[in-house]
């Protein structure tokens, strides 16, 4: 007959595993002794190996639950093509029987005592239940037996008292608007919400319990801009050293707007960041010397000659100046105290002259007195002799400029009855008053 052929036999459970297929003979399936077969689906699984006894099954339950009974177990001859020990064919069962005792004695029912008194009502107000109990001891059950029925019974009871209503909170109300519009000010901004003890309110008679917990909650506001912080001056810094070594100077103190620094649009510190003081060294300052104006040129002379006037003979002349006002170790005057030049003397020399053009108008004189006038002149100007403008006095020292010196006696044709100077005067018009400008400001 054809069988179902499997690739494995599971020793522990006696089951076929890994179905290869059906419609094959036992002989063909068992060409591989590791295989196993079933004659029908769900039937007994036989391995293809040579027959041997399976493990003993577990003991079956004891035939009775109390006092002495007996129990069975079995094993099976499994395999193909041969016999198990004792010349037993495959598929045969072998049994074992043993005595057993789950519980020595059998349970015996007990009997109830009479009912006890009713317990107080389960509540102190409105309606509840009350209970009474009885004991399973008349007689007591044996060997795990019990009494039939209930050990307690209950019935409704009415206290004839109205129950108090305990308070319960209603839901929280909305958060109030923030107590400030910015954070960092004198008061921390907070928002508040509250709830009422009204869901329900506690009863007055009989008195109910008030709501447990808190009715108000506060929390810090978030998302607010920082409050503006006005700037504050820090302390004045040290006075700077006097910047001068003599006379009066000016020292300075500085302070910084950082106590606190203005923040978040707060105003800058009012007032000045610096202040000055006069400092006095009590030391007079050095005064540098200054040259007076040059003195007059000395007469133009030539050594060893009595006079060179009105002659084409160069001479020499000098002028001096004085260094005045040097005090308290001030600098001496720079430069030469004496100036020397070469000259032609035309002192008192009669020279042909010519009238100059009109000079520009002079200043109005007197400037603050009555009837000021201005004047201009034409002068009889001498025509200087055509002497060489440079001379070489000492060989190797190069050419030196030569200057005409002295007051000649120019001769011009008479002009408007004058020989030397013709003057024209005019009054000054619309003359303003002389006033001290400082007094004018007052």
């Amino acid at each position: 007959d054809p069988v179902l052929c499997f690739t494995q036999y599971e020793e522990s459970s006696g089951k076929c595993k890994g179905l290869l297929g059906g419609g094959v003979s036992v002989e063909d399936c068992c060409l591989n002794t590791a295989f196993a077969y079933q004659k029908r689906s769900g039937g007994l699984c036989q391995p293809c190996r040579s027959p041997r006894w399976s493990l003993w099954s577990t003991w079956a339950p004891c035939s009775v639950t109390c006092s002495e009974g007996s129990q069975l177990r079995y094993r099976r001859c499994v395999g193909w093509n041969g016999q198990c020990s004792g010349k037993v064919a495959p598929g045969t069962l072998e049994w074992q029987l043993q005595a057993c005792e789950d519980q020595q004695c059998c349970p015996e029912m007990g009997g109830w005592s009479g009912w006890g008194p009713w317990e107080p009502c389960s509540v102190t107000c409105s309606k509840g239940t009350r209970t009474r109990r009885r004991a399973c001891n008349h007689p007591a059950p044996k060997c795990g037996g019990h009494c039939p029925g209930q050990a307690q019974e209950s019935e409704a009871c009415d206290t004839q008292q109205v129950c108090p209503t305990h308070g319960a909170w209603a839901t929280w109300g909305p958060w109030t608007p923030c107590s400030a519009s910015c954070h960092g000010g004198p008061h921390e901004p907070k928002e508040t919400r509250s709830r009422k003890c009204s869901a329900p309110e506690p009863s007055q008679k009989p008195p109910g319990k008030p709501c447990p917990g808190l009715a108000y909650e506060q929390r810090r506001c978030t998302g607010l801009p920082p409050c503006p912080v006005a700037g504050g001056w820090g302390p004045w810094g040290p006075v700077s050293p006097c910047p001068v070594t003599c006379g009066l100077g000016q020292t300075m103190e500085q302070r910084t707007c950082n106590h606190p620094v203005p923040q978040h649009g707060g105003p800058f510190c009012a007032g000045d960041a610096t202040r000055t003081h006069i400092c006095n060294t009590a030391v007079p300052c050095p005064v540098d010397g200054e040259w007076d104006s040059w003195g007059e040129w000395s007469p133009c002379i030539r050594r060893n000659m009595k006079s060179i006037s009105c002659q084409e003979i160069p001479g020499q002349q000098s002028r001096g100046r004085t260094c005045r006002g040097r005090k308290f170790d001030g600098h001496r005057c720079a430069g030469q105290q004496q100036d020397i030049r070469h000259c032609y003397s035309i002192q008192h020399c009669p020279l042909k002259g010519s009238w100059s053009e009109w000079s520009t108008w002079g200043l109005c004189m007197p400037p603050c007195g009555p009837n000021p006038t201005r004047a201009r002149q034409r002068l009889c100007t001498p025509l200087l002799p055509k002497y060489p403008p440079t001379v070489s006095m000492v060989e190797g020292q190069g050419e030196k400029n030569v200057t005409f010196w002295g007051r000649p006696l120019p001769r011009c044709e008479e002009l408007q009855g004058q020989k030397l100077v013709v003057e024209e005067k005019r009054p000054c018009l619309h003359v303003p008053a002389c006033k001290d400008p400082e007094e004018e400001e007052l």
Epitope: P212, G213, L214, E217, Q218, R219, R220
Partner: nanobody, 122 residues
Framework: QVHLVESGGGLVQAGGSLRLSCTAS????????VGWFRQAPGKERELIGV????????GYADSVLGRFTISRDDVKNTVFLQMDSVKPEDTAVYYC???????????????WGQGTQVTVSG
Amino acid sequence: QVHLVESGGGLVQAGGSLRLSCTASGGTVGDYAVGWFRQAPGKERELIGVVSRLGARTGYADSVLGRFTISRDDVKNTVFLQMDSVKPEDTAVYYCAARRDYSFEVVPYDYWGQGTQVTVSG
């Protein structure tokens, strides 16, 4: 184990002010929400206020709102109850207590102080 000690109680005139302190030792008060309770003679212990761990949230009972303020100074390891405009009915033993989580309900607190007496004379 946090040990809480209340101080600052005493006798005060009605309308006056008092500041109670709750100082922690053996732990950091900044790790806990702190509640203030009071118990008047013959009455149940009442929760009157609570402050959260970071001080961002506070809760108050109806009876003290606007008069009492709770604040905390974690550097000093102390929580304060500032009592202003006190009334004779504020007479009680005041307790502070600490728990891990902030709640404005009546919930169990893990650590309790021994209490400080406040008496308001009429």
